[in-house]
């Protein structure tokens, strides 16, 4: 091997990747908020809805201070992969009532996939463990009724909104540690 020639800089570095992840998360949060509002207008929710297959919220305001980079990124990636699966399921099995929201759900899925790719690149560049912790994947069957799919959509969008909200806070806090 010859003398070191040096390499041109690639398009980004881990800190830029983290900045990009924050921007993508904020953008996705705004999209989710808007879509959830549309859902409430079209199909008013009677109280809070939940779905057993959704991940439990990872963080609360009180635990933000003790966040560690590997834990946050791994958990965020696992949770977002679950929400991606649920959005794909909604688009596939949501039924005629949700067809009117198809363009918005498609855009949401594309943004989710983009954020997941950015997080993966960040974890690769930092050389953090990427394997998702083993957890049972609950199979998503077809909704029991049209109202069932609407309730599921409310639950998915509500959960994603909360997850993205803590993600923005967590990622901004982690920026100071990288």
């Amino acid at each position: 091997p010859g003398p070191p020639a040096g390499s041109p800089r690639v398009s980004s570095d881990p800190r830029a990747d983290l900045d990009s992840a924050v921007l993508l998360t904020r953008s996705l949060l705004a999209d989710t908020r808007q879509l959830a509002a549309q859902m409430r207008d079209k199909f008013p929710a009677d109280g809070d809805h939940s779905l057993d297959s959704l991940p439990t919220l990872a963080m609360s305001a009180g635990t933000l201070g003790s966040l560690q980079l590997p834990g946050v990124l791994t958990r965020l990636r696992v949770d977002l992969m679950s929400y991606l699966r649920h959005v794909q399921w909604l688009r596939r099995a949501g039924g005629p009532s949700l067809k009117t929201l198809e363009p918005e759900l498609g855009a949401l899925q594309a943004r989710l996939e983009r954020l997941l790719r950015r997080l993966q690149l960040l974890m690769s560049r930092l050389a953090l463990p990427q394997a998702a912790p083993d957890q049972p994947v609950i199979p998503l069957g077809p909704p029991a009724s049209a109202w069932g799919s609407i309730r599921a959509a409310h639950a998915i969008l509500g959960g994603l909104h909360l997850t993205l909200d803590w993600a923005v806070r967590g990622l901004l806090l982690l920026k100071t540690r990288l």
Partner: antibody, heavy 114, light 111 residues
Framework: EVQLLESGGGLVQPGGSLRLSCAAS????SSWGMHWVRQAPGKGLE????????????YYADSVKGRFTISRDNSKNTLYLQMNSLRAEDTAVYYC???????WGQGTLVTVSS | QSVLTQPPSASGTPGQRVTISCTGS?????????VHWYQQLPGTAPKLLIY???ERPSGVPDRFSGSKSGTSASLAISGLRSEDEADYYC???????????FGGGTKLTVL
């Protein structure tokens, strides 16, 4: 411009030890995970080991586990590979690489032979 | 034997388009991990050509493009040039290794 400069290679007898170093410059070393990747003469690339940006995670290929140790000193912008119990099949050019890997050094040749 | 499978050789004439495939498994490409491609010119160190399936680092011509589907990926080189003659490697993170795995490499010959 990013530079990764490996050193410490050479000829060593089977069972012997070597310590490779990689001096990094031109980027924020402490923000990047670092790898060692090797290439035997006329063969393809084989990943050897990785260490996370802060040194808290270290992983090894099965072929070197228990014999090689990766470490880093972020204050010196330097990556290390301690190689013990060397075998003939460890003969290769050893590259230091950063990121996915995004950046590669020019490599240092390690020859294990009696 | 490499964890990612590539054809050992590929060839094309100047101006042609060539494609190099890379097949993985459920612990790497199939697990959703991104694929990266490297070019190694004779006697030199590998150079990152494509990262995250289809993104080009600055300075890499747009003649090079990547794609990924399921457990496989491919690198396409259009408008082939003599200076593209090199070894090309794919790589992806692997869950079972906790590190990247490389393909066996494809030697590209420009006829």
């Amino acid at each position: 411009e990013v530079q990764l400069l490996e050193s410490g290679g050479g000829l060593v007898q089977p069972g012997g030890s070597l310590r490779l170093s990689c001096a990094a410059s031109g980027f924020t070393f402490s923000s990047w995970g670092m790898h060692w990747v090797r290439q035997a003469p006329g063969k393809g690339l084989e990943w050897v080991s990785v260490i996370s940006y802060d040194g808290s995670y270290k992983y090894y290929a099965d072929s070197v586990k228990g014999r090689f140790t990766i470490s880093r000193d972020n204050s010196k912008n330097t990556l290390y590979l301690q190689m013990n119990s060397l075998r003939a099949e460890d003969t290769a050019v050893y590259y230091c690489a950063a990121g996915v890997p995004d950046y590669w050094g020019q490599g240092t040749l390690v020859t294990v032979s009696s | 034997q490499s964890v990612l499978t590539q054809p050992p050789s590929a060839s094309g004439t100047p101006g042609q388009r060539v494609t190099i495939s890379c097949t993985g498994s459920s612990s790497n490409i199939g697990a959703g991990y991104d694929v990266h491609w490297y070019q190694q010119l004779p006697g030199t160190a590998p150079k990152l050509l494509i990262y995250s399936n289809n993104e080009r680092p600055s300075g890499v011509p747009d003649r090079f493009s990547g794609s990924k589907s399921g457990t496989s990926a491919s690198l396409a080189i259009s408008g082939l040039r003599s200076e593209d003659e090199a070894d090309y490697y794919c790589a992806a993170w692997d869950d079972s290794l906790n590190g990247p795995v490389f393909g066996g490499g494809t030697k590209l010959t420009v006829l």
